[in-house]
Interface confidence: low
C-alpha cells in the first residue's frame, strides 16, 4: 500500500494510473466504500463523501490514463485509505495528514519557552525534528519544547515529520521579542553628554507597552526609578522623570535616552524594562555607565573612575608621549608632584583604551587647566 503524507491546510494529489492511455471509467472511494468522485464520459461526478467540496481531479490527464484525486485544504480527519477503482483493479493509497502548531503566539519573549505540538492521525507514530534558525536541531514526538528562547531563535524554524520512511516539512516563523543586546556599557569623561540606546531585535507593525529605567548608582544604597514611559504604535511618551538627573527621551524607536552630563554620582548600572501589551513578562536590557575624572589639587594629580569596571581593567596616568608613570588595576591612581605637561588618564582593557581624559599640569606657580 502506497503511503502519502500531507500537511494540514495544504493540497494533496493522489495518483491513479491505468494501463490504457485513454479516458476510461474510474472511481475514488474511501475506506468505508463511500464514493468520493469518478467520471461519466468526460464529466466529473462526485459522491456523498464529506470531501465533496474539497475533492477534485485533473480532466486534462484522463486521456493519458491518469486519474488523480486532489484534496484541498487538508484536515487531520482526511487521513484514510483511498481506493481507486479502474480497469477492474483497485489501487490503495494511505493518506496521513499532519499539522504542526506553536503552543501560543509565535511572538515570544526572550527566555520564554516555545512548544510545538504535532497533530497526527490515530494509529500513526511519527517523529519530529526541528531546526532552529541558528542551526540547532531538536527532536521529539507529539510535542517538542525549547526552553529559554534566545534572540538567535528568531526566524523560520524548519520541522520535518517522519512516518513510514516518508517525510513532510513544516515552516513556522517565530519572533523572539528582545533587545538586540542583553547588556551594554558606556564610558564617559565627567561632564560629557551620555547617550543610551536600546534597539529592539524585532519589528512589528504596532508596538504598544510601557517601560521604566531603574538605576543603581554605585554611590547609592538603593536603586531608583529614573524614568517611566509609554509606547504607543512605536511612539514614545514620557510619563515621569526624576529631577536629578533630568533624562531626555527620544520620541521614536529605537528607545533612546540622553543624560545631559556624566557625573560620578550617576555612575552605576541600570535596568531598562519594557512590558509589551498582551504579553506576559518583560524585556530587559542592562546598561552600565563608567565615569572618569582627572583632577589636580595642590601637588597631587589624581585620576578616578566610578561605575561597574571589570577587575582586569587598568587605570594609568602618563605624561603625553611617555611611559605610564602609574598603572594599576584599581579605580583611582595618583602622582605626587607631577611635572608640567599634558597628562593622560587612561582606562584600558588588554591594551585597548576605553576612556581617556587629559589634564594640563602647569608649572608650579600656575593653576591647572582642564580641557
Amino acid at each position: 500500500k502506497k503511503v502519502v503524507l500531507g500537511k494540514k491546510g495544504d493540497t494533496v494529489e493522489l495518483t491513479c494510473t491505468a494501463s490504457q492511455k485513454k479516458s476510461i471509467q474510474f472511481h475514488w472511494k474511501n475506506s468505508n466504500q463511500i464514493k468520493i468522485l469518478g467520471n461519466q464520459g468526460s464529466f466529473l461526478t462526485k459522491g456523498p463523501s464529506k470531501l465533496n467540496d474539497r475533492a477534485d481531479s485533473r480532466r486534462s490527464l484522463w486521456d493519458q490514463g491518469n486519474f488523480p484525486l486532489i484534496i484541498k485544504n487538508l484536515k487531520i480527519e482526511d487521513s484514510d485509505t483511498y481506493i481507486c477503482e479502474v480497469e477492474d483493479q483497485k489501487e490503495e493509497v494511505q493518506l496521513l495528514v499532519f499539522g504542526l502548531t506553536a503552543n501560543s503566539d509565535t511572538h515570544l519573549l526572550q527566555g520564554q519557552s516555545l512548544t510545538l505540538t504535532l497533530e497526527s492521525p490515530p494509529g500513526s507514530s511519527p517523529s519530529v525534528q526541528c531546526r532552529s534558525p541558528r542551526g540547532k536541531n531538536i527532536q521529539g514526538g507529539k510535542t517538542l519544547s525549547v526552553s529559554q528562547l534566545e534572540l538567535q531563535d528568531s526566524g523560520t524554524w524548519t520541522c520535518t515529520v517522519l512516518q513510514n520512511q516518508k517525510k513532510v516539512e513544516f515552516k513556522i516563523d517565530i519572533v523572539v521579542l528582545a533587545f538586540q543586546k542583553a547588556s551594554s556599557i558606556v564610558y564617559k569623561k565627567e561632564g560629557e553628554q551620555v547617550e543610551f540606546s536600546f534597539p529592539l531585535a524585532f519589528t512589528v507593525e504596532k508596538l504598544t507597552g510601557s517601560g521604566e529605567l531603574w538605576w543603581q548608582a554605585e554611590r547609592a544604597s538603593s536603586s531608583k526609578s529614573w524614568i517611566t514611559f509609554d509606547l504607543k504604535n512605536k511612539e514614545v511618551s514620557v510619563k515621569r522623570v526624576t529631577q536629578d538627573p533630568k533624562l531626555q527621551m527620544g520620541k521614536k524607536l529605537p528607545l533612546h535616552l540622553t543624560l545631559p552630563q556624566a557625573l560620578p554620582q550617576y555612575a552605576g548600572s541600570g535596568n531598562l524594562t519594557l512590558a509589551l501589551e498582551a504579553k506576559t513578562g518583560k524585556l530587559h536590557q542592562e546598561v552600565n555607565l563608567v565615569v572618569m575624572r582627572a583632577t589636580q589639587l595642590q601637588k597631587n594629580l589624581t585620576c578616578e573612575v566610578w561605575g561597574p569596571t571589570s577587575p582586569k581593567l587598568m587605570l594609568s596616568l602618563k605624561l603625553e608621549n611617555k611611559e605610564a608613570k602609574v598603572s594599576k588595576r584599581e579605580k583611582a591612581v595618583w602622582v605626587l608632584n607631577p611635572e608640567a605637561g599634558m597628562w593622560q588618564c587612561l582606562l584600558s582593557d588588554s591594551g585597548q583604551v576605553l576612556l581617556e581624559s587629559n589634564i594640563k599640569v602647569l608649572p608650579t606657580w600656575s593653576t591647572p587647566v582642564q580641557p
Epitope: 534558525p133 541558528r134 551594554s184 585597548q352
Partner: antibody, heavy 118, light 108 residues
Framework: EVQLVESGGGLVQPGGSLRLSCAAS????????VHWVRQPTGKGLEWVST???????YYPGSVKGRFTISRENAKNSLYLQMNSLRAGDTAVYYC????????????WGQGTTVTVSS | EIVLTQSPGTLSLSPGERATLSCRAS???????LAWYQQKPGQAPRLLIF???SRATGIPDRFSGSGSGTDFTLTISRLEPEDFAVYYC?????????FGPGTKVDIK
C-alpha cells in the same frame, strides 16, 4: 583608530592548508562578533564564517568541515584555518567586525589574497 | 538558505539623479537583520545601512533604506560622483548569512 589587518594569504596547492590571521586594534575586541567574508576576483561577496563573543561559530555549507574560525581575545586576533583547499576557494579574504548593538559589518580589513592553484 | 536577489544588475544614471536599488529575499527576513554595503574598485566594502533603514556612522543622509519581509530598497536621493560603485545587501536572519549578487551603479 579602529582597524583590522589581515595576513597569511598566499599561493597554495589544491588539497593544501593555510591559516589567515586578522589583527584588531582601536576597540575592545572581545565585545564584538567577528566575521570572515571572501570575494573572488570580479565577483560578489560571500560570507565564510562568524565567531560570536561567546566563541560560538557559524559556517555556510560550502566551507563547513574544512574551515575553522577561532579568536584569541588576549591577543586581539581572529584566525581562519583553511584545510582541503579547492580552486573555488581562491579569493580576497576580508575580516570584518559585527556591529556592537546592531547587525551589520561596520569595520573591514583591507583583505588578503588566497590563490589555490597547482 | 535565504537567497537574496538584487535588481537591476546594473543601473546607469547621471550625477544628481535618484537611484533605487532592490533586494528581494527568498523568504521573510526581519528588517533588523538586513544591511546594505557599498564597494568601490580595489577597496573593502563599507557599511551604509543596518536594520534595513538605519544609517551607519558617517553615511550621508542621501542614502536611505526601507522595506520589510522579503522586499527591501536602498535609495540614493541625488547621486554624487563618489556614489558610483557596487552595492550589496546582506541578511543575518538565518545562517548562512548570505549576500545579494550586487547592483553596479555606473555613470550614464
Amino acid at each position: 583608530e579602529v582597524q583590522l589587518v589581515e595576513s597569511g594569504g598566499g599561493l597554495v596547492q589544491p588539497g593544501g592548508s593555510l591559516r589567515l590571521s586578522c589583527a584588531a586594534s582601536g576597540f575592545t575586541f572581545s565585545n564584538y562578533d567577528v566575521h570572515w567574508v571572501r570575494q573572488p576576483t570580479g565577483k560578489g561577496l560571500e560570507w565564510v564564517s562568524t565567531i560570536g563573543t561567546a566563541g560560538d561559530t557559524y559556517y555556510p555549507g560550502s566551507v563547513k568541515g574544512r574551515f575553522t574560525i577561532s579568536r584569541e581575545n588576549a591577543k586581539n586576533s581572529l584566525y581562519l584555518q583553511m584545510n582541503s583547499l579547492r580552486a573555488g576557494d581562491t579569493a580576497v579574504y576580508y575580516c570584518a567586525r559585527g556591529g556592537y548593538d546592531y547587525y551589520g559589518l561596520d569595520v573591514w580589513g583591507q583583505g588578503t589574497t588566497v590563490t589555490v592553484s597547482s | 538558505e535565504i537567497v537574496l536577489t538584487q535588481s537591476p544588475g546594473t543601473l546607469s544614471l547621471s550625477p544628481g539623479e535618484r537611484a533605487t536599488l532592490s533586494c528581494r529575499a527568498s523568504q521573510s527576513v526581519s528588517s533588523t537583520y538586513l544591511a546594505w554595503y557599498q564597494q568601490k574598485p580595489g577597496q573593502a566594502p563599507r557599511l551604509l545601512i543596518f536594520g534595513a533603514s538605519s544609517r551607519a556612522t558617517g553615511i550621508p543622509d542621501r542614502f536611505s533604506g526601507s522595506g520589510s519581509g522579503t522586499d527591501f530598497t536602498l535609495t540614493i536621493s541625488r547621486l554624487e560622483p563618489e556614489d558610483f560603485a557596487v552595492y550589496y545587501c546582506q541578511q543575518y536572519g538565518s545562517s548562512p548569512f548570505t549576500f545579494g549578487p550586487g547592483t553596479k551603479v555606473d555613470i550614464k
